[in-house]
Interface confidence: medium
Amino acid sequence: KSPIFGPEEVNSVEGNSVSITCYYPPTSVNRHTRKYWCRQGARGGCITLISSEGYVSSKYAGRANLTNFPENGTFVVNIAQLSQDDSGRYKCGLGINSRGLSFDVSLEVSQGPGLLNDTKVYTVDLGRTVTINCPFKTENAQKRKSLYKQIGLYPVLVIDSSGYVNPNYTGRIRLDIQGTGQLLFSVVINQLRLSDAGQYLCQAGDDSNSNKKNADLQVLKPEPELVYEDLRGSVTFHCALGPEVANVAKFLCRQSSGENCDVVVNTLGKRAPAFEGRILLNPQDKDGSFSVVITGLRKEDAGRYLCGAHSDGQLQEGSPIQAWQLFVNEESTIPRSPTVVKGVAGGSVAVLCPYNRKESKSIKYWCLWEGAQNGRCPLLVDSEGWVKAQYEGRLSLLEEPGNGTFTVILNQLTSRDAGFYWCLTNGDTLWRTTVEIKIIEGEPNLKVPGNVTAVLGETLKVPCHFPCKFSSYEKYWCKWNNTGCQALPSQDEGPSKAFVNCDENSRLVSLTLNLVTRADEGWYWCGVKQGHFYGETAAVYVAVEERKAAGSRDVSLAKADAAPDEKVLDSGFREIENKAIQDPRLFAEEKAVADTRDQADGSRASVDSGSSEEQGGSSR
């Protein structure tokens, strides 16, 4: 499929001008190659009318130009003094006309309306309101006022001052007669439909002395705004419908076959299943405007989108609307990354998040998508040191591996962690990618004790058991803090006895804390990695207390203080089911500072959308 994109249809009237924008992927080659606009012939060829290399056909001399905007990845063709002869099929493209790097555009130039003398032209957008003003003379002040619509050869009564309303206009038309001082009546038609367009006649009086005024009503279907976004990227639709619909339900829909427009999301709580986990509807402002963000763009998201306002929360005749034509560029600059990551209860996941490598200094964020109401994505962690209170000790955002990818590690998983998460940065490109975490059946691979108590001034040794599947991985211990996890020295103590059916390649790696101080209290992680790519982690909370008798502590899996959520295994080792067991002393001062975000933590459900791009939580 060609990555060139432009308007499928362009409509104009004789004598007017058009401006046609064509989009292309802004690669170095594309930015500098020839741009052209050509007319398709009946036998298949395409005759160049204008190009970026300076050529202008005699048909376009003095009335057209082509301008390239390489920094935007667009070029614009302007054509003036249109005639009906300009109607036809065209291509805008790059390179050589016959190479296929092009987009088909249909240009339709119609004859201007043949208007009667003294005709007032009203041009109004679909779904909006028009007020047709009708002046009259004093002698007709007390006489019947009426509005007719010309249907073929015959005028058809639309409304009059005796109370008649044509059934096609019921509930959306009124006739206002101004105060005695003003010799004017007006007809207000709202929720305008395309079928309302045409010639109208307003009349005061019914005899030969009646006052008449002609009006031509043109109802404009909104021209779709072209939107060009990368596959796997995101798009934001800004919808400004005006204050008159501020209190009416809003919707975004996608046009399918014919006139159908399937609701993508609306303010009444409806959301299409295909957009679960990757859409937010930003609530409207007082002026009736709102925006919709869609992330993780797919090929099938391409198409025409309409936003509108209607009490039903869906497109109806007479809804005020705005339109976009979304093109999803498959030659995306956004690299593939797993869209589903799987982990087990008590285990961990390491999520890889892409970002624009030109924006390595940008701040990285990770938020949790929640579907309630119009969707929201509360922040969980950022690369600057902010971590949501409930995630302290089990969530970390690492700049590694760098060069266009960062890593988010979440451990002590429970079923409540299943759901959709967004990776994003504050860079100019505003990349947003979506990943779904699924919690599957299974046991965590790494085995550590439950919460551990260390004694001030003594030595503490904490074991971590790695199964043989991680024999080729680097094994590490680190101390968690809100800016990451600082590596600590650890000792390989040889094969582990914690695994059944596991050979000598299993490993017991211990963390040793010498001369324990109060500063040693906190969360410690053991984990595996390959270079800068992280695998599984397991977390242990170390509490520090005073003890009278001296000595050192060597904590085995069986010796650590039993916690209610732990199971004692037959082998004498214990595994943590782990509901983020926190020592009550942890961050006591900080806990007193209420984080308003934490109070809005709704339940989260996992939606299995099925994906071919899945990654397990245990390894890369």
Epitope: Y365, P378, L430, R432
Partner: nanobody, 121 residues
């Protein structure tokens, strides 16, 4: 919209002190990060210090031990106490506020107009 107003800039002797203050007003629900950045002619803006909504503070190396960030009870005013000033501290200091939008899934960033700090040796 959020407006940030800085005050407290001016001239100080090397080794002396200055206190910068920044107040946020407008449609504020909760500020996630308030920070001070500085910029010297021909250079990019650089971070000096910042405070998060959970009251964790972060200082760049050159500010550690000399500068102190504090926040008012309402969390919408942040002060930067600068002690032991050095000629290299001379710059335009900008207040920065960041507010995470759950509904847009992004961090919105706001800047003050800047206040000039001059350090004479």
């Amino acid at each position: 919209e959020v407006q940030l107003v800085e005050s407290g800039g001016g001239l100080a002797q090397a080794g002396g002190s200055l206190r910068l203050s920044c107040t946020a007003s407008g449609t504020i629900s909760k500020i996630d990060v308030m920070a001070w950045y500085r910029q010297t002619p021909g250079n990019e803006r650089e971070l000096v210090a910042r405070i998060f909504s959970n009251d964790v503070t972060h200082y760049v190396d050159s500010a550690k031990g000399r500068f102190t960030l504090s926040r008012a009870q309402d969390k919408n005013t942040v002060d930067l106490q600068m002690n032991s000033l050095e000629p290299d501290d001379a710059a335009v200091y900008y207040c920065n506020a960041q507010i995470w939008s759950d509904m847009r899934g992004r961090m919105d960033t706001y800047w003050g107009q800047g206040t000039l700090v001059t350090v004479s040796s």
